[in-house]
């Protein structure tokens, strides 16, 4: 029996060198969120603890900014940032809810060519 639901930004794309906001929202439950962890595949990016606030992993400090809200902002995107991202909500008394986002980082030249292309 699942009580709450995680809504995410789903599959998103962004341009190399740009920034993107990763957002998740927990709904349909009255459970109290005690902590949210953000992971990129097998790496911990950031933690937002209800009492202690935000902690950004040292290896991502230069390119990851907390917020807005419980979301996460990724900056100076590279093609290597393409992949799965997970928001993991720890709640009381329900337990843990996990949402998945797939980010594709596009070469800026691809985006530019795409914008200029016109059908005759």
């Amino acid at each position: 029996m699942m009580t709450g639901t995680i809504e995410t930004t789903g599959n998103i794309s962004a341009e190399k060198g740009g920034s993107i906001i990763l957002q998740c929202h927990l709904s349909s439950t009255t459970a109290q969120v005690t902590q949210v962890n953000w992971e990129q595949q097998d790496q911990l990016l950031a933690i937002c603890n209800a009492d202690l606030g935000w902690h950004i992993s040292p290896s991502f400090k230069d390119r990851v900014a907390p917020g807005p809200g419980l979301g996460l902002t990724l900056q100076s995107l590279t093609v290597n940032d393409t992949g799965e991202y997970f928001c993991i909500y720890h709640t009381y008394p329900d337990g843990t809810y996990t949402g998945r986002i797939f980010l594709e980082v596009l070469e800026s030249s691809v985006a530019e060519h795409g914008a200029r292309f016109q059908i005759p």
Epitope: M1, I6, Q35, F86, I88, T98
Partner: nanobody, 127 residues
């Protein structure tokens, strides 16, 4: 196929301690939702404790109100084993304890539906 085998049950006096183990095979996902459940004589099965872990380092444990502060769920990655440390045991903790694993990690808690179950181990708390 996932297989779960519990051990460690037995007879213990009120106020005593016991540690249950659950050896898992075939459950090798990077994100895991595992838990302990129990079924007392003549009652339905209830969630006791669950543990969400990921290869990214996330480790979130959740407990039923009736055991919070007395029971601790943990795991040994190298042995692929789940544990339940039970302290300050009470007669009402008497039950068959089951280890369980869930395929999906969208929700991991004592009220989640689990996919794989062990055969159970009996814990009796009596003087």
């Amino acid at each position: 196929e996932v297989q779960l085998v519990e051990s460690g049950g037995g007879l213990v006096q009120p106020g005593g301690s016991l540690r249950l183990s659950c050896a898992a095979s075939g459950y090798t996902y990077s994100r895991k939702c595992r838990g302990w459940f129990r079924q007392a004589p003549g009652k339905g099965r209830e969630g006791v404790a669950t543990l969400y872990t990921s290869s990214g380092g996330t480790y979130f444990d959740t407990y039923a109100d009736s055991v919070r502060g007395r029971f601790t769920i943990s795991r040994d990655n190298a042995k692929n084993t789940l544990y339940l440390q039970m302290n300050s045991l009470r007669p009402e903790d008497t039950a068959v304890y089951y280890c369980a694993a869930r395929l999906s990690t969208d929700f991991c808690g004592p009220r989640a539906d689990f996919d794989y179950w062990g055969q159970g181990t009996l814990v009796t708390v009596s003087s």
